[in-house]
Structure formats: structure tokens, C-alpha cells
Amino acid sequence: PMFIVNTNVPRASVPEGFLSELTQQLAQATGKPAQYIAVHVVPDQLMTFSGTNDPCALCSLHSIGKIGGAQNRNYSKLLCGLLSDRLHISPDRVYINYYDMNAANVGWNGSTFA
Amino acid sequence: PMFIVNTNVPRASVPEGFLSELTQQLAQATGKPAQYIAVHVVPDQLMTFSGTNDPCALCSLHSIGKIGGAQNRNYSKLLCGLLSDRLHISPDRVYINYYDMNAANVGWNGSTFA
Amino acid sequence: PMFIVNTNVPRASVPEGFLSELTQQLAQATGKPAQYIAVHVVPDQLMTFSGTNDPCALCSLHSIGKIGGAQNRNYSKLLCGLLSDRLHISPDRVYINYYDMNAANVGWNGSTFA
């Protein structure tokens, strides 16, 4: 799995342990080993949500399986909670796109997962 | 909806009201309320199009519905026009990927839109 | 086609001709003309893979057609090789998401490819 956060929150406001915490929490939530999880946080972005530049985040979670109605609701609760607690971003100013990737469409280590 | 522009145009060349204008224009074009629209502009990028680093842009528009053949052509005309007028990027150096998102695959406010 | 690389490798470690090389290699691999190929490299990113911040990369390749099981394995071999040779990123710390785009969902030059 790969989780990406783009946010207008400044770099200085991203806690040191945030990526580690995301890795562990996503491993637990997806049931995938932490060694397969990639996390990417992009602060200081030029972005607006509802036309204002109050703190906001545009995110994506890509996974081979483990994506679906109930699971995505769980991930959203978890991730919006972390973004609120750690980056002070209001949950109603967060979008998270979920992608259920086909194993043949994910490259890794010189090949694919298919 | 969420509109993202990645471009090699410098930050100083992004007009003050560009994100606001994109928000309003996309609200009108998609028929979705402006309060649901997120805009993200990423200038100063290391990118090439056709092997050259003349001004260019790689964009994406994610929406739950309102994506389709005729609609995408309209969005492309609108967005390429704005990128040309505001950032001076030639329309033949712009790609825009359109994504019709399933409501269950978009997280917001601690849950999803499903 | 559009190839995007996000990496925690610093800007100074991205060779001068890297984007040109990617353009040529992708043109050859996809069988698409170089003038249609866009390349975007984003260095200095705040990212982890397997919970560590050793060099890693999160990539995507979008194309209208030319995406599939065998082709993606070929692209992965090629791209992981280039990322290893040029940016010194271990292939087992690279993910590449492949997207087979519908022509109607790719905007260019004020319209779409449909």
C-alpha cells in the first residue's frame, strides 16, 4: 500500500514521528506488513478547499485489495483522525481517494505483483 | 471535485487569484457547489513534455460523477484556456487525466461519500 | 504517456540528462512518439518505504493503451533499472502504478483524445 498526503500545512508543523505512525497504523488497518507500506507527505502546498486556504489535505491510498465500502470508511475515520490530531486539519477539509490496484498494474523490484 | 495542476512554470508566475478562479470555474462547469471543490497548484516542477522543458502542465480532475466524453471535452477547453491565459502554457503541452470516482472510494470528514 | 517519479533522493543527485533519457526510453518501450511523452521528477520528498527513509521512489505511468501484464513487467524492469543506475534507488524500494487511460479521459490541447 501507498499513502500520500498533500497539504498546505507547513513542514515545521509535521511531527517527526508522523510517517512512522502512519506506517504502523496503516499496517494494522490494512492487515498488510509494514515493510510493504510506503508513505509520502507533501507539506507547504498551494491549495484551497471550498475556496479558502485554511488547513486542508488531499490524499490517496493505493492498495492491491483491502479496498471497499466498509474498509474505506474505517480508513477515513483513522486517517482523518490522524490528520486532525497531528496536523490540525479539520476532517471536513480532507479528501482521500482510494484505489484498488490490480496486481498486474503495480510495479516493484523490477517486475509486477502479478 | 479535486483539480490538481503540476507545472514547471515558476511560483511567481501564478497569479494571485488563480486558485479562486479555478474553484469558481470548476463549480460552474461541474455543477457542483464551490464548497466541495479542492484545487492544488504545484509550480516550479522538474518536468518535460515532448522532451523539452518549455512551459507545460500535467493535471488531474477527480469527481464523483460529472465525468464523461462530452463533459471532459468541455473541461479540457475551459482548463487549457485558463492555463494558457493565466500561466502562458500552450494547450498542446497540457495533459489532464479525468477520474470518475466511485462515492465509496472517496473519503471525507471521517467517512466516505457512500 | 506520462511518467511521474516522486523520490526522497535530493535534487542534486538527479543527473542532468535523466528526464531526456526517460523520455527516449519510454518512447522506445511504449512504441509511442517521444513528442507525446511527459516526464515529471519530484526529488527531496518526505517519504518512507518499509518505515525507513532510505532512498525510495513512488511512481506512476499513465498511457492510453500499451498497459498490460507483460508490458508492465517490461516497464518495471526498465524503470527500476534506470532508478537504480541513475538515482541509486534499490528496486525493492520502488512502486510504480500503471494506469490504462481511456482516450475520453485524457485531456489535451483543449479537447480529449476521444
Epitope: P15, E16, G17, S20, H88 | - | -
Partner: antibody
């Protein structure tokens, strides 16, 4: 200058009530998350309550030891945060500090008031 | 609740010496740890956040390290103004607990 100033402390009998106030200045109070922390020789420093900003619906959280007895609130127009304490016990005795971390700074307790002393005794 | 165990509880040292105070969390708190200094009769002052980042205006004689469950605060070349009490605190999740404190006294 960033400043927090507590008031309202004093002597109160067990079972009684008391309301503490904290006036903030020098930063955008509306964006700040505000906290009460107390200190006593017996228990040391102890987080008591938290109230988030309007953008976070003024969400409130409490230490288990005060839940149901204490209420944190805020008035953004007055740049003030309050702690209403009821059913007070001897173990609530201590110095009560108002503290905050505000948007744009680190997200830690980087601003503290001088404290106000609460004594619960008969 | 996460327990924060600080050691030593008290410490005597001379001006110019180097001292290290440690803090152990009862579970993984990543780097969500802060250190405070408190002088007699005053409120706590933030010294270090994110386990190792010095707060604004804090001299480089202070340094924080650690992650997970083991953390330390090092003070080199002790000065008279460094004497007082030091506390660690986690903010990984509520309740945000503090260590019991370390009283640093002049020998």
C-alpha cells in the same frame, strides 16, 4: 508578545464549584487548541482538559479523573478559555495552568500562563 | 494509559559538567515527546519537541534524542540558569501524561 493569564483560583470546600478563566493575547486565538494542566506535589504535572478550535467544532476531551465534573469552554470573541469545576475533591488541589499550541507553531505546549492556585479544603 | 518513567528523580552536578536525564514510555510513542524545564515558582517552559527539536530560543547546550520508548535529554556545560526541574511529556494520545520529573541541583 504571546501571553496567557489565568484567574479565578482560591479556596473552596470539598463538593464545591469554581470557574477558572484564561485570557490570551499575542496570537490568533481562534486557531489555537487550548488546554488546562495542573500541578500538585502529590501527582506532579497532569493534563486535565483540551478544547479544539472552531474549525474542529470546539471538540473537548478530559482526563478520566475529572470527566463529568469539569467542563472546558471557550469564547473566541474574548480570546478566553474557561474551566468550570464542580464536585471538587481534595485531590483537585494544585496550580492550574492554561497552555496552548497555536497554528503555525509546533503542535506542542509552547505557551503557558503563570498559573492560578486552587485549594480544596474544609 | 501510557506511563512515562523519568530517571533519576534528582541529580546533583557542578557548573560545567554534562548531565543526561532519561525518560521511558510504557509503549511506543514514536517521536511524540517533549521536554520542559521548570524553575521554582514558575510555569514550565518548552525546551525540546519531537524528541529532538530545540524550541525557539533554547541554547544548543540542550539536546534531545530517542524514539519509540527510550528518550533522553542531555545538557552540556551546565550553567547556573540550568538548575531546576525537568519533565518529559508524551502527546501520542490522550491522556497526555508527564514524567515524574528530575530535580537538577547544584553540587
Amino acid at each position: 508578545e504571546v501571553k496567557l493569564e489565568e484567574s479565578g483560583g482560591g479556596l473552596v470546600q470539598p463538593g464545591g464549584s469554581m470557574k477558572l478563566s484564561c485570557a490570551a493575547s499575542g496570537f490568533t486565538f481562534g486557531d489555537a487548541w487550548m488546554y488546562w494542566v495542573r500541578q500538585s506535589p502529590e501527582k506532579g504535572l497532569e493534563w486535565v482538559a483540551e478544547i479544539r478550535s472552531k474549525a474542529h467544532n470546539h471538540a473537548t476531551y478530559y482526563a478520566e479523573s475529572v470527566k463529568g465534573r469539569f467542563t472546558i469552554s471557550r469564547d473566541d470573541s474574548k480570546s478566553s478559555v474557561y474551566l468550570q469545576m464542580s464536585s471538587l475533591r481534595a485531590e483537585d488541589t494544585g496550580i492550574y495552568y492554561c497552555t496552548s499550541h497555536h497554528y503555525g507553531s509546533s503542535w506542542y505546549f509552547d505557551v503557558w500562563g503563570a498559573g492560578t492556585t486552587v485549594t480544596v479544603s474544609s | 494509559d501510557i506511563q512515562m518513567t523519568q530517571s533519576p528523580a534528582s541529580l546533583s552536578a557542578s557548573v560545567g559538567e554534562t548531565v543526561t536525564i532519561t525518560c521511558r514510555a510504557s509503549e511506543n510513542i514514536y517521536s511524540y515527546l517533549t521536554w520542559f524545564q521548570q524553575k521554582q515558582g514558575k510555569s514550565p517552559q518548552l525546551l525540546v519537541y519531537d524528541a529532538k527539536t530545540l524550541a525557539e530560543g533554547v541554547p544548543s547546550s540542550f539536546s534531545g534524542s530517542g524514539s519509540g520508548t527510550q528518550f533522553s535529554l542531555k545538557i552540556i556545560s551546565l550553567q547556573p540558569e540550568h538548575f531546576g526541574s525537568y519533565y518529559c511529556q508524551h502527546h501520542y494520545g490522550r491522556p497526555y501524561t508527564f514524567g515524574g520529573g528530575t530535580k537538577l541541583e547544584i553540587k
